[in-house]
Amino acid sequence: PKSRNLFERNPNKELKPGENSPRQTPIFDPTVHWLFTTCGASGPHGPTQAQCNNAYQNSNLSVEVGSEGPLKGIQIWKVPATDTYSISGYGAAGGKGGKNTMMRSHGVSVLGIFNLEKDDMLYILVGQQGEDACPSTNQLIQKVCIGENNVIEEEIRVNRSVHEWAGGGGGGGGATYVFKMKDGVPVPLIIAAGGGGRAYGAKTDTFHPERLENNSSVLGLNGNSGAAGGGGGWNDNTSLLWAGKSLQEGATGGHSCPQAMKKWGWETRGGFGGGGGGCSSGGGGGGYIGGNAASNNDPEMDGEDGVSFISPLGILYTPALKVMEGHGEVNIKHYLNCSHCEVDECHMDPESHKVICFCDHGTVLAEDGVSCIVSPTPEPHLPLSLILS
């Protein structure tokens, strides 16, 4: 990515060209990174301490997992050194619909650069994928999945709506939240939105641009719920069982709509991270602002993706992009400041620990180690056939 003057907007610290922030570690290893996953958890509830201990046992990661209240399932990580870090958040994908054969709605990625102090506590909720409508262990539902049973289509034909045989929409994907605590109040750094759940019915894919918020004075509301649940936002409240919960309320995924559960137990719950539960329409994705679900139970209405967020304390390094096909992730790395390089890209030589600038294709690094110049073309050689003739 080409991103010039990266720290211009950073209110915390101005970095002089070629300088990285003070380090507590004598040797900076740019290859070190910390990858946070769902620890094997899936569905509407987050991981336990035991799951994360097991998942990270052969890695450089050690986390404490919240066990009760709104922090249940949230991974708490202590920053190892004062430094500038890149934090990549990836929201989870929404669930597939029963007859919706297109790919699931991908979770959003957001990458930001932040200055963090040694022993800062980062709170990390890794979003979990919304549940798929198919396949199902329930024979009755599986017959719908494979096209042997058309009770939904029949009800639509007769009533022009779905009520008795509701269900078959995917659950909304959970958002991935990275935040700090200030005086006991969560302060968001990055929120990567979850994808909306797909509706039961197949239809042409509609393009919705990724939405990104960077103003924390904007209210972090839940998405609107209909028969399916809206996605959970940052700090809203809901009493609806099928709505995704906001981070403030624990960010659990919503249940399937009551109609679907009551008739045939078609369970398509939203993912942890505020995914809304599915009905015949899809559940909304979690986010800073949750994604809306259809106001009725339209079996062709996908749930909306949530809205992503980046704190003004950080710098957005890449635009929000829909990339995640499954559960979310968080990847934290030491950030190497390359703003002195002509193309803002560099790497650290692992032996000399010197910063070496990159150049675009067709150019080479000048002697100043910063500028890029057009590579000098060598003298053209005559073809061997001409020399021999």
Partner: antibody
Framework: QVQLQQSGAELVKPGASVKISCKAS????????MNWVKQRPGKGLEWIGQ????????TYNGKFKGKATLTADKSSSTVYMQLNSLTSEDSAVYFC?????????????WGQGTTLTVSS | DVQMIQTPDSLAVSLGQRATISCRAS??????????MHWYQQKPGQSPKLLIY???NLESGIPARFSGSGSRTDFTLTINPVETDDVATYYC?????????FGGGTKLEIK
């Protein structure tokens, strides 16, 4: 693990009412129908009715309409069955039973039963 | 209501032999290509326990010597081979139509 814990045995007089309870644990209480089934000594099983705790929706066997009233308390994950105008015919063991896969499913977990004796 | 007739009322089988219990519904209990017929076991002084759901599916944790078959109105529960632990009363139940109804039960004893 799923558990259904019923209240203890009851001895009541004819004409009175009784309310028996069934506390559920180990699953999403609001998302599954809870049923009640009657078994008289040495007799078969009779379905009384069901309640969906998520929204309080109820369905009754016509034979028990006016006899049984089902309620649910989501905060305590407990369902209740009130039986009124009791007669000796109501002396039986009553089971609460979870429906799995909605009302088109099957009874997968049963409470231990509550013995009701109606006698003067 | 759908009537469920179980036969026989009682059955005595030698250990290691096959026990067969029949259940006949007064009308078809099939719908959407599925039989809404289930079998339960009740041991003396205990609650009923699910054995077979939707005619032929073995509930998790139930030994494979239990099996179910049939469709529409005629269904069979088979226990082969019978063990002492199988002494109980067995009930069939339909829920294709409300109200759900049970058979009268078949009491299995060891000969």
């Amino acid at each position: 693990q799923v558990q259904l814990q019923q209240s203890g045995a009851e001895l009541v007089k004819p004409g009175a009412s009784v309310k028996i309870s069934c506390k559920a644990s180990g699953y999403a209480f609001s998302s599954y129908w809870m049923n009640w089934v009657k078994q008289r000594p040495g007799k078969g099983l009779e379905w009384i009715g069901q309640i969906y705790p998520g929204d309080g929706d109820t369905t009754y066997n016509g034979k028990f309409k006016g006899k049984a009233t089902l309620t649910a308390d989501k905060s305590s994950s407990t369902v209740y069955m009130q039986l009124n105008s009791l007669t000796s015919e109501d002396s039986a063991v009553y089971f609460c039973v979870r429906y799995y896969y909605g009302s088109s499913g099957y009874f997968d977990y049963w409470g231990q039963g509550t013995t009701l004796t109606v006698s003067s | 209501d759908v009537q469920m007739i179980q036969t026989p009322d009682s059955l005595a089988v030698s250990l290691g032999q096959r026990a067969t219990i029949s259940c006949r519904a007064s009308e078809s209990v099939d719908n959407y290509g599925i039989s809404f017929m289930h079998w339960y076991q009740q041991k003396p002084g205990q609650s009923p326990k699910l054995l077979i759901y939707r005619a032929s599916n073995l509930e998790s944790g139930i030994p494979a010597r239990f099996s179910g078959s049939g469709s529409r109105t005629d269904f069979t529960l088979t226990i082969n081979p019978v063990e002492t632990d199988d002494v109980a009363t067995y009930y069939c139940q339909q829920n294709n139509k409300d109200p759900p109804t049970f058979g009268g039960g078949t009491k299995l004893e060891i000969k």
